[in-house]
């Protein structure tokens, strides 16, 4: 059943989440900028077909529209999405020495955000079952594929975060 924005989420949790989304968006933008500057891979829309063939998935947030937000489902989808992106970012490891530190920080920040979401779900008695394993992750056959994958994963992640931010901001409104 839908739960309105005045649902049982503490303001401190929502503000922490908004902070974390902004931090990850900054990390993601830095990764995109470096991929563009170093490898001239600047337009994710040009790589969409390659993304399909590589099998890079999207994370849904269908339980999160502000008009009919289902709190448990939305938080669960947020957590599942972050779990998915942890795996996708892990698949990019070794992308290049120049991008390594940025990717490392992005990976940890995504993991920390997933922890924050899970912690709150646990406090509300709605923690999901632990996902035992990652689903099938894309296998990159070449350096180019890995870098192109980096552009797409960063782009998908940014889209996911934009929706997340809107949802969290909506929930944070009194």
């Amino acid at each position: 059943t839908p739960l309105g924005p005045a649902s049982s989420l503490p303001q401190s949790f929502l503000l922490k989440c908004l902070e974390q989304v902004r931090k990850i968006q900054g990390d993601g933008a830095a990764l995109q900028e470096k991929l563009c500057a170093t490898y001239k891979l600047c337009h994710p829309e040009e790589l969409v077909l390659l993304g399909h063939s590589l099998g890079i998935p999207w994370a849904p947030l269908s339980s999160c529209p502000s008009q009919a937000l289902q709190l448990a489902g939305c938080l669960s989808q947020l957590h599942s999405g972050l779990f998915l992106y942890q795996g996708l970012l892990q698949a990019l490891e070794g992308i290049s020495p120049e991008l390594g530190p940025t990717l490392d920080t992005l990976q940890l920040d995504v993991a920390d955000f997933a922890t924050t979401i899970w912690q709150q779900m646990e406090e509300l008695g709605m923690a999901p079952a632990l996902q035992p394993t990652q689903g099938a992750m894309p296998a990159f056959a070449s350096a180019f594929q890995r870098r192109a994958g980096g552009v797409l994963v960063a782009s998908h992640l940014q889209s996911f975060l934009e929706v997340s931010y809107r949802v969290l901001r909506h929930l944070a409104q009194p």
Partner: antibody
Framework: QVQLVQSGAEVKKPGASVKVSCKAS????????MHWIRQAPGQGLEWIGY????????NYNQKFRDRATLTADTSTSTAYMELSSLRSEDTAVYYC????????????WGQGTLVTVSS | DIVMTQSPLSLPVTPGEPASISCRSS???????????LYWYLQKPGQSPQLLIY???NLASGVPDRFSGSGSGTDFTLKISRVEAEDVGVYYC?????????FGQGTKLEIK
């Protein structure tokens, strides 16, 4: 309450390896990253790396990338830090500390494990 | 890597007097989200470090309010308004803006 209990002190010869354990209790272990930090005698703190137990992903400080291996066993809620090709400069107290964001970061530490490397 | 530099390295203080420790980072720790990713830890003799202050100025749970943190993007200060005997130990600043996380060399506070 959250507790991190580390294995006991170790004495190793140069060139050997050491494996330190950190058993967690009082929280859902796979959900939090676990970091490892060391402190040489009379020195400051040095970040070694972290493990994300939920996906088995580890990340290392460049300085330790060739010699450190971080692992986690979710069935026993235990994190491990293995350091190979030990040298005298590796003599230090090794700590595990639970990760997180904001007020959660390194809010919980193990008691430390002294590793002495001596011939 | 971001380099964290503390001063002084040793700080003798009379109980009841104020104390101040400085920390400087080689890169701004102020993120575009408005948060400064600077932490302070205290390691009491024979103990593991404990969290004192997070995100430059927020007091960790259970930390007495005689402790306070302030600063800008690269220059930070930990203040103790009135030092007590239990405050002795080594104080570390640390950054968690980006990996690898790095710590200052530590400031040893001792009672005169």
């Amino acid at each position: 309450q959250v507790q991190l209990v580390q294995s006991g002190a170790e004495v190793k010869k140069p060139g050997a390896s050491v494996k330190v354990s950190c058993k967690a209790s009082g929280y859902t272990f796979p959900i939090y990253t676990m970091h490892w930090i060391r402190q040489a005698p009379g020195q400051g703190l040095e970040w070694i790396g972290y493990i994300n137990p939920s996906i088995g992903y580890a990340n290392y400080n460049q300085k330790f990338r060739d010699r450190a291996t971080l692992t986690a066993d979710t069935s026993t809620s235990t994190a491990y830090m293995e350091l190979s090709s030990l040298r005298s400069e590796d003599t230090a107290v090794y700590y595990c500390a639970r990760g997180g964001y904001g007020d959660s970061l390194f809010a919980y530490w193990g008691q430390g494990t002294l590793v002495t490397v001596s011939s | 890597d971001i380099v964290m530099t503390q001063s002084p390295l040793s700080l003798p203080v009379t109980p009841g007097e104020p104390a101040s420790i400085s920390c400087r980072s080689s890169k701004s720790l102020l993120h575009s989200n408005g948060i400064t990713y600077l932490y302070w830890y205290l390691q009491k003799p024979g103990q593991s470090p404990q969290l004192l202050i997070y995100q430059m100025s927020n007091l960790a749970s259970g930390v007495p309010d005689r402790f306070s943190g302030s600063g800008s993007g690269t220059d930070f200060t930990l203040k103790i308004s009135r030092v007590e005997a239990e405050d002795v130990g080594v104080y570390y600043c640390a950054q968690n803006l980006e990996l690898p996380y790095t710590f200052g060399q530590g400031t040893k506070l001792e009672i005169k």
